[in-house]
């Protein structure tokens, strides 16, 4: 039961995370005009990965797409790529994990197959989360660099008669959404990997062959060097799972502390 819960929770957490990554990627507020220590401008600028917007004090908002591909900074292209890779991997991971869910029966799918699929989706979620966190962090670093450069410009070269309003950009809402979403996807992926351990047999399972000895039965397991010796009247052939010593309910899930960036 604990494995199913861990797997289900991992799926839900990853689903929320990937939805967040998609939302962050589509959001326009990756960088927003820094209002601190600035004159009260009647326009508010903010930018996303795909377009830049201006919200006028009058309430009207105008957005313009980045219609050029070659003219865009390489860093922005890299961030776009990271976010898209994150979304694609996450989407594939979700698709795989749906079929891997223990609560969903698909034909006569073996537990080992489900375990492999759970692990695959878990790894995909982890990579997806890392891509999102990396993308957002690269963009944030770009903002910090530009912020301090424009701050330096504000206090130098003001010798001329005409002053210009230096528009500085700071972290937008999309960055925080991206960081949290990436973190959730990562956590979901880790949970899927943990669930996989509970689903998977530790060794390849074969039908055990029972040899009847007088007084006790010894079941030999070909391929393994373990034998289960049972005293009692049960002399029927039985499937022996190495992981059978643990029931689903007995699988322990250890609470872990996750720090959000």
């Amino acid at each position: 039961m604990a494995v199913t819960a861990c797997q289900g929770l991992g799926f839900v957490v990853s689903l929320i995370g990937i939805a967040g990554i998609i939302a962050a990627t589509c959001m326009d507020q990756w960088s927003t005009q820094d209002l601190y220590n600035n004159p009260v401008t009647a326009v508010f600028n903010y930018q996303g990965l795909w377009r830049s917007c201006v919200r006028e004090s009058s309430g009207f908002t105008e957005c313009r797409g980045y219609f050029t591909l070659l003219g865009l900074p390489a860093m922005l292209q890299a961030v776009r790529a990271l976010m898209i890779v994150g979304i694609v991997l996450g989407a594939i991971g979700l698709l795989v994990s749906i079929f891997a869910l223990k609560c969903i029966r698909i034909g006569s799918m073996e537990d080992s197959a489900k375990a492999n699929m759970t692990l695959t989706s878990g790894i995909m979620f982890i990579v997806s989360g890392l891509c999102a966190i990396a993308g957002v962090s690269v963009f944030a670093n770009m903002l910090v660099t530009n912020f301090w450069m424009s701050t330096a410009n504000m206090y130098t070269g003001m010798g001329g008669m005409v002053q210009t309003v230096q528009t500085r950009y700071t972290f937008g809402a999309a960055l925080f959404v991206g960081w949290v979403a990436g973190g959730l996807t990562l956590i979901g992926g880790v949970m899927m990997c943990i669930a996989c351990r509970g689903l998977a047999p530790e060794e390849t399972n074969y039908k055990a062959v029972s040899y009847h000895a007088s007084g006790h039965s010894v079941a030999y397991k070909p391929g393994g060097f373990k034998a289960s010796t049972g005293f009692g009247s049960n002399t029927k052939n039985k499937k022996i799972y190495d992981g059978g010593a643990r029931t689903e309910d007995e699988v322990q899930s250890y609470p872990s502390k996750h720090d959000y960036v």
Epitope: T41, A42, S57, S58, G59, V162, T164
Partner: antibody, heavy 118, light 113 residues
Amino acid sequence: DVQLVESGGGLVQPGGSRKLSCAASGFTFSSFGMHWVRQAPEKGLEWVAYISSGSSPIYYTDTVKGRFTISRDNPKNTLFLQMTSLRSEDTAMYFCARFYYGNSFDHWGQGTLVTVSA
Amino acid sequence: DIVMTQSPSSLTVTAGEKVSMSCKSSQSLFNRGNQKSYLTWYQQRPGQPPKLLIYWASTRESGVPDRFTGSGSGTDFTLTISSVQAEDLAVYYCQNNYIYPLTFGAGTKLELK
């Protein structure tokens, strides 16, 4: 058709108070930011105050800060300017104007004259 | 505060003539976000409230005759009337719409000979 009608002007003694109103019609008042602009006799235009569609933010010109209060009643489609501690230099024609694209003022009222004199 | 300087303070022209008036701001009114300058031109005929002519320095308001043209960017702006008509007799104001307080220029009075 967009219409803005100011009222409440008149003769006021220095140090006195006055409340101006601007009745709006012909547009969704609650969706637009509004301004008060004044014009002293034979002088140029001077921006006085701004209130956004949702009543926040609000901005004032330095000369009226702390003395004038701009407010609005969206259900009643009315803009207000409460003026206190009036001075002779506040004598002017007061116009209300609607905020538009480019932060421009596309529709203006006919104005209401406020005269501050002893 | 941004200071708006208009010149000349008055212009005397004959009907049909082309006329230009200038407006300079003490700070740039150009917004990099949308590549637009936040300067507006108004016309105020005697005894009337101001009327919007041009916003974003060069965008003509609907219903405004095409003889009115706005140009310029940053700090230097110009309003041009290609062929002055009798009804153009008015005071023309430029306004900073970029930084509060939204200051106006002192105006350019257009008079007919």
